[in-house]
Interface confidence: medium
C-alpha cells in the first residue's frame, strides 16, 4: 500500500487551531515539478457534505512530502469529508477523513467501519441532543432509510446492513428530520472486496494474518498497519510518538500523538494513534489495553507488563506476543511462507533461528518434500540469531511442495514449513512473426506461444545473416511491444530466433525455432537536382540532371521524370532505365503547355525524394519545315545554305534557326538565328577547314516549327577557294571549336 497518512488535529476548543496534515513516505512524493511524482493534494470534498461557504482554506507545503490545510474560522467549517491524494501512476491513492461536529444532535459511536464482503455492518448513531422527530439515514448523500424517533435502542439509532458488497462503501449519515445537516452523525463504511482473510482476483489468495489490528488489502494482500506498527504483518511496534510504514514520521508537539486522528489508505480507514482512544483521541488506554483506539488486549503472561503503545514487554528469558514463549525454546525467525525457484538452478536457502542455548550450524536442518534432509554448508552467527545457509542440489520438478526448516537444541525444537514452487523457464513453441520489412530494418512480433511458466520478464531476439558463422546479434525487448531490428543489410536473409526469460536466477529458457526474414530492396536515398532543360521543338524537351557525390555504389535502377500539366490535370511519367543517365529527351509533349517537371531516382519499386520542380513553357506549334535545303562549300571556313520558304504558312515568319553540328561529333549542336526572314540563303562562317558538317533549319512564327531535312557538306582544304555567287547573311560570331 502507499505510505500516505492524513492527520487531523482534534483540539477543537478553537477552530482556528484546527489543522489537517497529509504526510507521504513515498520516494519523491509530492515534489511536483522538481521530482518524479505528482504533488500531494489535500482538499475538502463538498460533493456529499456541503457546508456554508466561508473564507478559503490555506494550503501550505512544508517540505517535500507534507501538506497542511489551515484557516478554519468556525466549527461548521470542520464538518464533512476531507481527502488527501498521493502516490504516482497506478499507485495514486486517496485517503479520506470524516469530521463530525462535537455539538451535533447525533454522534457516531465509531466513525470508520471496515468490514469484509458478505458481512453485516452495523452503524450506531448515539443521541447527543434529543429531538422527537424521525431519523433519516443517507448513503453518499442520497436517501437510504428512515427510523421513528422512538426506535432508538439504549439512546442509539442503529442501521443494519446485511451481506454488504463493495458498492455499499461510502459516506453514511444519520440526521434528525428538519434538523441542520451539520448536526448529523457521519460515518465511513469500507467494504473489502473479499471475504475475511482472502485477497486477490477471485479472492483465492490467503492474507498473511495481519497483527495488531492491521487490515489485509484486498488487491495486493499487504497489511495496512495501524499507526504505530510496522512490518509485513504489523508485528513490530514503533517507538512512542512515531508512525508511517517504517516508523519514519514523528507526531508533532510535546504530547506526542494525543488528540490526533490518523487516516490511512483503504481498507484501514481512521483511528487514534497507538496508545490513545476516545472521540477526540485524548484519552490514554485503560490498563491492559494497547494499540490504535486501545482496541488490543495485552493478556501478558510470565510477568510481562502491558505498554499501551507496544503491548507486552517481556521479562528476560521470555518472548512472544503474550510473553508465552521461553527463550530457552529455539525459534525460527522471519521465514518466508513461499519461495519460487527456476528448474535446474542450485539456489541458496537461508534459515535463521534464535534460542537458549544458542542454535549452532548442526542444529538447523532443511527437509525436502521427499524427506531428504539437507545440512547447512555455513552459518552466520550474530548476537541475536544464527542464520544457516543451505546449498540446494539442482532442482527438479518433484522438488515443488512443502519444505521444512527445523531447529533442535537441548531447550526444545521449532519448525517452520514453507512452500517451494519450482518453475519451468519458458521456451517458444513458434518462430517470431515478421510484421513489416524495409531495406535496412525488420519489424518483428516477438511474443509467441511458449511451454513452461510465465510471467515473461524479458524477451531476447537473436538474429544474424542467413548461412553466416558470425556471432548472433541480440536485442532485449519489452515483452508487450513489437521490435524493430535496425541497421540491417538490404536484400539479405536473416535467421531470427526468440529466447524468453522468467524472473529469477536461471529463468532463461532455450532458444525457440529459427525463421528466415529477408530485408527489402534498399530505398534510393539520393535526391537529384535538375540542372538544365531546353526546348528542342514545340513537343520536345531535353532535360539534364545531377546526383550528389556520395561514397559507395549508387543504389538505384534508374530515374523517373514526371511532367505535370496543371491545366489539363494530367501527369506524364518517363522512365529512364539507366542509373548512369544524366539526360533525357522527352517527346510527344503538348505544344504551348506549361509543365512542372521533377526527377526521382528509383530502385525496385521504391522512389527516392523528388528534385525541386522546374517550370517549363513549351512554345505553341510553329510553321512547317523549310523546303529544299542545300549546302555548298565556299571556302575552308564558309558554307552557303539555300532553301525555299515553307508552304501554307499560318502567319509571317519572324526568323529562321539553323542547327550546325560536326558530323560524327559528340558535342552539343550550335544554333544560329537568321533574323531576315525574307532571305532564302545564308553563309555560315568561322568553320574549320576540311571538316564535314551537318545542317538543318526551321522557321519561327510564334513558336519554332518543324526541322527541315538534314544536309551534309565539307569545308574546302586550306588555300582552296570556291567559285560562284556569295550572298551575305548574319553568321556565327564564334568558331564551333571554341
Amino acid at each position: 500500500a502507499v505510505d500516505l497518512t492524513l492527520l487531523a488535529n482534534l483540539r477543537l476548543t478553537d477552530p482556528q487551531r484546527f489543522f489537517l496534515t497529509c504526510v507521504s513516505g513515498e520516494a519523491g512524493a509530492g515534489r511536483g515539478s522538481d521530482a518524479w511524482g505528482p504533488p500531494l493534494l489535500l482538499e475538502k470534498d463538498d460533493r456529499i457534505v456541503r457546508t456554508p461557504p466561508g473564507p478559503p482554506l490555506r494550503l501550505a507545503r512544508n517540505g517535500s512530502h507534507q501538506v497542511t490545510l489551515r484557516g478554519f474560522s468556525k466549527p461548521s467549517d470542520l464538518v464533512g469529508v476531507f481527502s488527501c491524494v498521493g502516490g504516482a501512476g497506478a499507485r495514486r491513492t486517496r485517503v479520506i477523513y470524516v469530521h463530525n461536529s462535537p455539538g451535533a444532535h447525533l454522534l457516531p459511536d465509531k466513525v470508520t467501519h471496515t468490514v469484509n464482503k458478505g458481512d453485516t455492518a452495523v452503524l450506531s448513531a448515539r443521541v447527543h441532543k434529543e429531538k422527537q422527530t424521525d431519523v433519516i439515514w443517507k448513503s453518499n448523500g442520497s436517501y437510504f432509510y428512515t427510523l421513528d424517533w422512538h426506535e432508538a435502542q439504549d439512546g442509539r439509532f442503529l442501521l443494519q446492513l446485511p451481506n454488504v458488497q463493495p458498492p455499499s462503501s461510502g459516506i453514511y449519515s444519520a440526521t434528525y428530520l428538519e434538523a441542520s445537516p451539520l448536526g448529523s452523525a457521519f460515518f465511513r463504511l469500507i467494504v473489502r472486496g473479499c471475504g475475511a482473510g482472502r485477497w486477490g482476483p477471485g479472492c483465492t489468495k490467503e492474507c498473511p494474518g495481519c497483527l495488531h489490528g492491521g487490515v489485509c488489502h484486498d488487491h495486493d494482500g499487504e497489511c495496512v498497519c495501524p499507526p504505530g506498527f510496522t512490518g509485513t504483518r504489523c508485528e513490530q511496534a514503533c517507538r512512542e510518538g512515531r508512525f508511517g510504514q517504517s516508523c519514519q514520521e514523528q507526531c508533532p508537539g510535546i504530547s506526542g500523538c494525543r488528540g490526533l486522528t490518523f487516516c490511512l489508505p483503504d481498507p484501514y480507514g481512521c483511528s487514534c494513534g497507538s496508545g490513545w482512544r476516545g472521540s477526540q483521541c485524548q484519552e490514554a488506554c485503560a490498563p491492559g489495553h494497547f494499540g490504535a483506539d486501545c482496541r488490543l488486549q495485552c493478556q501478558c503472561q510470565n510477568g510481562g507488563t502491558c505498554d499501551r503503545f507496544s503491548g507486552c514487554v517481556c521479562p528476560s528469558g521470555w518472548h512472544g506476543v503474550h510473553c508465552e514463549k521461553s527463550d530457552r525454546i529455539p525459534q525460527i525467525l522471519n521465514m518466508a511462507s513461499e519461495l519460487e525457484f527456476n528448474l535446474e538452478t542450485m539456489p541458496r536457502i537461508n534459515c535463521a533461528a534464535a534460542g537458549n542455548p544458542f542454535p549452532v550450524r548442526g542444529s538447523i536442518e532443511l527437509r525436502k518434500p521427499d524427506g531428504t534432509v539437507l545440512l547447512s554448508t555455513k552459518a552466520i552467527v550474530e548476537p541475536e540469531k544464527t542464520t544457516a545457509e543451505f546449498e540446494v542440489p539442482r532442482l527438479v520438478l518433484a522438488d515443488s511442495g512443502f519444505w521444512e526448516c527445523r531447529v533442535s537444541t537441548s531447550g526444545g525444537q521449532d519448525s517452520r514449513r514453507f512452500k517451494v514452487n519450482v518453475k519451468v523457464p519458458p521456451v517458444p513453441l513458434a518462430a517470431p512473426r515478421l510484421l513489416t520489412k524495409q531495406s535496412r530494418q525488420l519489424v518483428v512480433s516477438p511474443l509467441v506461444s511458449f511451454s513452461g511458466d510465465g510471467p515473461i520478464s524479458t524477451v531476447r531476439l537473436h538474429y544474424r545473416p542467413q548461412d553466416s558463422t558470425m556471432d548472433w546479434s541480440t536485442i532485449v525487448v519489452d515483452p508487450s511491444e513489437n521490435v524493430t531490428l535496425m541497421n540491417l543489410r538490404p536484400k539479405t536473409g536473416y535467421s531470427v530466433r526468440v529466447q524468453l526469460s522468467r524472473p529469477g536466477e536461471g529463468g532463461e529458457g532455450a532458444w525457440g525455432p529459427p525463421t528466415l526474414m529477408t530485408t527489402d530492396c534498399p530505398e534510393p536515398l539520393l535526391q537529384p537536382w535538375l540542372e538544365g532543360w531546353h526546348v528542342e521543338g514545340t513537343d520536345r524537351l531535353r532535360v539534364s540532371w545531377s546526383l550528389p557525390l556520395v561514397p559507395g555504389p549508387l543504389v538505384g535502377d534508374g530515374f523517373l521524370l514526371r511532367l505535370w500539366d496543371g491545366t489539363r490535370g494530367q501527369e506524364r511519367r518517363e522512365n529512364v532505365s539507366s542509373p548512369q543517365a544524366r539526360t533525357a529527351l522527352l517527346t510527344g509533349l503538348t505544344p504551348g503547355t506549361h509543365y512542372q517537371l521533377d526527377v526521382q531516382l528509383y530502385h525496385c519499386t521504391l522512389l527516392g525524394p523528388a528534385s525541386p520542380p522546374a517550370h517549363v513553357l513549351l512554345p505553341p506549334s510553329g510553321p512547317p519545315a523549310p523546303r529544299h535545303l542545300h549546302a555548298q562549300a565556299l571556302s575552308d571556313s564558309e558554307i552557303q545554305l539555300t532553301w525555299k520558304h515553307p508552304e501554307a504558312l499560318p502567319g509571317p515568319i519572324s526568323k529562321y534557326v539553323v542547327e550546325v553540328q560536326v558530323a560524327g561529333g559528340a558535342g552539343d549542336p550550335l544554333w544560329i538565328d537568321v533574323d531576315r526572314p525574307e532571305e532564302t540563303s545564308t553563309i555560315i562562317r568561322g568553320l574549320n577547314a576540311s571538316t564535314r558538317y551537318l545542317f538543318r533549319m526551321r522557321a519561327s512564327i510564334q513558336g519554332l516549327g518543324d526541322w527541315s531535312n538534314t544536309v551534309e557538306e565539307s569545308t574546302l582544304g586550306n588555300g582552296l577557294q570556291a567559285e560562284g555567287p556569295v550572298q551575305e547573311s548574319r553568321a556565327a560570331e564564334e568558331g564551333l571549336d571554341q
Epitope: L525, Q527, P548, V550, P609, A610
Partner: antibody, heavy 120, light 107 residues
Framework: EVQLLESGGGLVQPGGSLRLSCAAS????????MVWVRQAPGKGLEWVSV????????GYADSVKGRFTISRDNSKNTLYLQVNSLRAEDTAVYYC?????????????WGQGTLVTVSS | DIQMTQSPLSLSASVGDRVTITCRAS??????LAWYQQKPGKVPKLLIY???TLQSGVPSRFSGSGSGTDFTLTINSLQPEDVATYYC?????????FGQGTRLDIK
C-alpha cells in the same frame, strides 16, 4: 569548419526590398544545394526557398513565389535572397542552411540568422 | 504541398519521464523525415534524420521511429537540458515543410 554567415537584414517599409546574403566557408560550396528558412518572432520554422548546386534550378514556398528570388555566386561562395514587395508577415529571422547531399536528410549546418523587420 | 501536423503542441513532463512527440504527414513520405531541437534564441539543431538515424553527438536517450505518414520522437529519460521546441520536417517533395513545433518544458 563549416560556417554560414547571413547579412543584409534590417528595418524596411511594406512594399520595400532587401537583398540577403549568406557567405559560406569550410566546404566546397559549388557541390551543395542551399536553402533559406525563416522564423517569425515566437513562431515556428518555415521553409522558404532552395537552389541547386549549379544554380540552374530553384524552388519556392507558395507564400513567397513571385516576390522572392534565390540565387548564388559559386565563385564568391555566396548565396543570395532578393526579397521584394515585402509584407508585415515577412517579418522574421532568415536562416540559410546547407541542403543534404543525400542519405542524411536534414539540415545540419545553419547560419545564425539575419532579422528582417517590415513595418511602417 | 505536404502538411506536417505535430502533437501535442506543448507538453510538460518531469525529469526522468519518457516523452513522446508525434508527427503526421498528410501523405506518405517514406523515411524522409528529420527532427530538430531549438532552444530559445538558438538555431535549430538536427537530432534525427531519415526518420530513425541519430545524428552524431546527440544523446542516446533521443530516438525516432515511423515511416509513411506517422512518426515519433521519443526522449527516454527527460533531462532539464531537453527543455526546447521540437520540429519535424519532411524531405520527400518540395516544399520541404516543417511541423508547427512542440514546446516541451519540465513540471
Amino acid at each position: 569548419e563549416v560556417q554560414l554567415l547571413e547579412s543584409g537584414g534590417g528595418l524596411v517599409q511594406p512594399g520595400g526590398s532587401l537583398r540577403l546574403s549568406c557567405a559560406a566557408s569550410g566546404f566546397t560550396f559549388s557541390m551543395y544545394g542551399m536553402v533559406w528558412v525563416r522564423q517569425a518572432p515566437g513562431k515556428g520554422l518555415e521553409w522558404v526557398s532552395v537552389i541547386s548546386p549549379s544554380g540552374g534550378n530553384t524552388g519556392y514556398a507558395d507564400s513567397v513565389k513571385g516576390r522572392f528570388t534565390i540565387s548564388r555566386d559559386n565563385s564568391k561562395n555566396t548565396l543570395y535572397l532578393q526579397v521584394n514587395s515585402l509584407r508585415a508577415e515577412d517579418t522574421a529571422v532568415y536562416y540559410c542552411a546547407r541542403a543534404p547531399r543525400g542519405y542524411s536528410y536534414g539540415y545540419y549546418y545553419w547560419g545564425q540568422g539575419t532579422l528582417v523587420t517590415v513595418s511602417s | 504541398d505536404i502538411q506536417m501536423t505535430q502533437s501535442p503542441l506543448s507538453l510538460s513532463a518531469s525529469v526522468g519521464d519518457r516523452v513522446t512527440i508525434t508527427c503526421r504527414a498528410s501523405q506518405g513520405i517514406g523515411h524522409y523525415l528529420a527532427w530538430y531541437q531549438q532552444k530559445p534564441g538558438k538555431v535549430p539543431k538536427l537530432l534525427i534524420y531519415t526518420a530513425s538515424t541519430l545524428q552524431s553527438g546527440v544523446p542516446s536517450r533521443f530516438s525516432g521511429s515511423g515511416s509513411g505518414t506517422d512518426f515519433t520522437l521519443t526522449i527516454n529519460s527527460l533531462q532539464p537540458e531537453d527543455v526546447a521546441t521540437y520540429y519535424c520536417q519532411q524531405f520527400n517533395s518540395y516544399p520541404h515543410t516543417f511541423g508547427q513545433g512542440t514546446r516541451l518544458d519540465i513540471k
